[in-house]
C-alpha cells in the first residue's frame, strides 16, 4: 500500500506565439482545480476507461479575476498535493491523465458552471521511494508544471512497496539474512514469508502466509496468466483431473466501480469505495446533476434532475467526451493526401498543400519535372512535390551543373594516392597498407615479436594514422 | 572513443571450424572499416581479413578459400568464420577498426585460438 502525490507548480500559458485568452474575466471570476487519473501499465486507453489505480479531485484554487489589458499569467493553484492512494503494490510503471478545470462563479442559475481547460496525458516509470520527478506538459497554447512521486505507507517499503519493515528486535543489527530497511535504518525488513510456491515475480504479500496476485496474474500461487482462462470450474481451483487452477469469474473481476472506485469482495457480491466527488453502487454518480450545467460546448444535458441518477451528455457535431469537452480531432483521419498539412477550422477542414501538389485534398500530382533541365546528362527524378536530378557520374550539384571531385574528401587512408576514374574513384595504398581504401596495414607499424600490440599501446588504445 | 571485444576463440583439432565474434560499441560498424589481425608466439601481427565501409572484403593469400569476414549492422559485429583450420592458423586473433571519421585505428584485447590434435 502507498500514496502516489501530485504537486501542480503552475497552469500558464506556454512559451511561443498565440497566447491563451485568459479564462477568468471581471464579469466571470473563476479558479481552478484538478483531477488526476492513473491506470497502472503503458496504458493508451481512452481517457474515459477507468481509472483502475485511482483517481483524486484537488480542492479549488483562489478566485482569481483579470486584469484588464494584463496577459494571461500563471493561474492561482489550489494548496496541497493531489493524493492517490493505492491499496496493493504500486505498480511501476503507469499511465495519468490530469485534467485542468475551471469553475466559474458568476450569477449565473443553478450555481457555478464548470469547464475543462487543459487536459494532458502520458505514460511513465516510476519507483516508489524515489524522489519527486518533474514534468512539463503542454496542451494547447496552455502549459502544466508539476511533480510527482509515489511513496509506501508502513511498513510497506521498497519499489513496488510489497516489502515490510518491522522495528529492530536487537539494538545492534538485524536477524541473519534480512537488511536494514533504508532510510529507516532503525527498522529490519520483517521476515515475511509468504505462501509456500507464492510466484515470487507475479505474486506478493503482506501477510505471512497468504499470496496476493500483480495485476494480470491469478490462481492460488498467482502463476497463471489472467488472459489464459479456459477453465469454466466453480471460484477456486479444480479437481485435479482438469489440472486447472484459474479461478471462476468473481464480483470484483474486471473492476465494476467506475471513476477510480476500488472493489473489495463480500460474502455476496462487491462493493465500491468510491474517490472524492463520486458515489453509488458502481461510483457511477459524480455528484453532478444536470441544473449544474455539466455539458460544454452545446452539448445537451438528460437526466440527472435528482442527485441519485447520473446525466448524461448528448454532445453536437464535432465534439466527444462524456461531457462533451473534446473536440472531434477531423484530422486524425488523413483526409490530406500526399503529405498535406490537414487545418480543422471549425466550420470546415483544409489542406495546406506541399509543392507540386494541388486540390482540395492536394490529390493533384503537379508534373515536378515540367520545364526543369539536368545538365550534363543528368535525368530528372520526380517526387515529394520537388524534382530532382540523377546525374550522369562525375558531376553533382543540384542541377548537375558541379564538377563532382570524388578524390576531394581524401577518401584513401594511410597517405594512399587517389586516382578519379570513370567508375568513381582508385587509391593506390602505400607500401604495406591493403583494402579498397588502404585502410588495413598489412604488419600494424611494424609490431615484432610479444607483447602483441603495436608499440607503446596497449590493446584497446586509439592510434591516430592520417 | 571506439571499444571492441572478441569472443570465440579456444582449442579446435586440425580440419576443424571456428567462429569469432568482434562487437563494437561507441560507432556503428557501418560507418567503420573493420579487420581481423593475428599474432603467433614469436611472430609479428598479421592482416588476415578486413572488410571495408563499403563492404568490399580483402583476404591474406593463406586464408583465402578457407576464412569469410562478415558484418552485422543489427548485432553492430563483425565475424570471421574459419573453416579447415591448420596448425599454423595457431594465434592470438585481434579485432581492428577504422574509423574515418576521425582517421584513428582501435584494438580489441584479443582472442586465443589454438589448432591441435
Known amino acids: 500500500a502507498g500514496v502516489f502525490e501530485l504537486q501542480i507548480h503552475s497552469f500558464g500559458p506556454g512559451p511561443g506565439p498565440g497566447a491563451p485568452r485568459s479564462p477568468c474575466s471581471a464579469r466571470l471570476p473563476c479558479r481552478l482545480f484538478f483531477r488526476v487519473c492513473l491506470k497502472p501499465g503503458l496504458s493508451e486507453e481512452a481517457a474515459e476507461s477507468p481509472c483502475a489505480l485511482g483517481a483524486a479531485l484537488s480542492a479549488r484554487g483562489p478566485v482569481y479575476t483579470e486584469q484588464p489589458g494584463a496577459p494571461a499569467p500563471d493561474l492561482p493553484l489550489p494548496d496541497g498535493l493531489l493524493q492517490v492512494p493505492f491499496r496493493d503494490a504500486w505498480p511501476g510503471t503507469f499511465s495519468f491523465i490530469i485534467e485542468t478545470w475551471r469553475e466559474e462563479l458568476g450569477d449565473q442559475i443553478g450555481g457555478p458552471a464548470w469547464s475543462l481547460l487543459a487536459r494532458v496525458a502520458g505514460r511513465r516509470r516510476l519507483a516508489a521511494g524515489g524522489p519527486w520527478a518533474r514534468d512539463i506538459q503542454r496542451a494547447g497554447a496552455w502549459e502544466l508544471r508539476f511533480s510527482y512521486r509515489a511513496r509506501c505507507e508502513p511498513p510497506a517499503v521498497g519499489t513496488a512497496c510489497t516489502r515490510l519493515c518491522r522495528p529492530r528486535s536487537a539494538p545492534s543489527r538485524c536477524g541473519p539474512g534480512l537488511r536494514p530497511c533504508a532510510p529507516l535504518e532503525d527498522e529490519c525488513e520483517a521476515p515475511l514469508v509468504c505462501r509456500a510456491g507464492c510466484s515470487p515475480e507475479h505474486g506478493f504479500c503482506e501477510q505471512p502466509g497468504e499470496c496476493r496476485c500483480l495485476e494480470g496474474w491469478t490462481g492460488p500461487l498467482c502463476t497463471v496468466p489472467v488472459s489464459t482462462s479456459s477453465c469454466l470450474s466453480p471460484r477456486g481451483p479444480s479437481s485435479a483431473t482438469t489440472g486447472c487452477l484459474v479461478p471462476g469469474p468473481g464480483p470484483c473481476d474486471g473492476n465494476p466501480c467506475a471513476n477510480g472506485g476500488s472493489c473489495s469482495e463480500t460474502p455476496r457480491s462487491f462493493e465500491c469505495t468510491c474517490p472524492r466527488g463520486f458515489y453509488g453502487l458502481r461510483c457511477e454518480v459524480s455528484g453532478v446533476t444536470c441544473a449544474d450545467g455539466p455539458c460544454f460546448n452545446g452539448g445537451l444535458c438528460v437526466g440527472g434532475a435528482d442527485p441519485d441518477s447520473a446525466y448524461i451528455c448528448h454532445c453536437p457535431p464535432g465534439f466527444q467526451g462524456s461531457n462533451c469537452e473534446k473536440r472531434v480531432d477531423r484530422c486524425s483521419l488523413q483526409p490530406c493526401r500526399n503529405g498535406g498539412l490537414c487545418l480543422d477550422l471549425g466550420h470546415a477542414l483544409r489542406c495546406r498543400c506541399r509543392a507540386g501538389f494541388a486540390g482540395p485534398r492536394c490529390e493533384h500530382d503537379l508534373d515536378d519535372c515540367a520545364g526543369r533541365a539536368c545538365a550534363n546528362g543528368g535525368t530528372c527524378v520526380e517526387g515529394g512535390g520537388a524534382h530532382r536530378c540523377s546525374c550522369a557520374l562525375g558531376f553533382g550539384g543540384r542541377d548537375c551543373r558541379e564538377r563532382a571531385d570524388p578524390c576531394a574528401a581524401r577518401p584513401c587512408a594511410h597517405g594512399g594516392r587517389c586516382y578519379a576514374h570513370f567508375s568513381g574513384l582508385v587509391c593506390a595504398c602505400a607500401p604495406g597498407y591493403m583494402g579498397a581504401r588502404c585502410e588495413f596495414p598489412v604488419h600494424p607499424d611494424g609490431a615484432s615479436a610479444l607483447p602483441a600490440a603495436p608499440p607503446g599501446l596497449r590493446p584497446g588504445d586509439p592510434q591516430r594514422y592520417l | 572513443e571506439v571499444q571492441l571485444v572478441e569472443s570465440g576463440g579456444g582449442l579446435v583439432q586440425p580440419g576443424g571450424s571456428l567462429t569469432l565474434s568482434c562487437a563494437a560499441s561507441?560507432?556503428?560498424?557501418?560507418?567503420?572499416?573493420m579487420a581481423w589481425y593475428r599474432q603467433a608466439p614469436g611472430k609479428k601481427r598479421e592482416l588476415v581479413a578486413g572488410?571495408?565501409?563499403?563492404?568490399?572484403?580483402d583476404y591474406i593469400d593463406s586464408v583465402k578459400g578457407r576464412f569469410t569476414i562478415s558484418r552485422d549492422n543489427a548485432k553492430n559485429s563483425v565475424y570471421l568464420q574459419m573453416n579447415s583450420l591448420r596448425a599454423e592458423d595457431t594465434a592470438v586473433y585481434y579485432c581492428?577498426?577504422?574509423?574515418?571519421?576521425?582517421?584513428?585505428?582501435?584494438w580489441g584485447q584479443g582472442t586465443l585460438v589454438t589448432v591441435s590434435s
Open positions: 581492428y577498426a577504422y574509423r574515418w571519421t576521425t582517421r584513428v585505428t582501435y
Open positions: 561507441g560507432s556503428r560498424v557501418s560507418f567503420l572499416s
Open positions: 572488410i571495408s565501409k563499403d563492404g568490399s572484403t
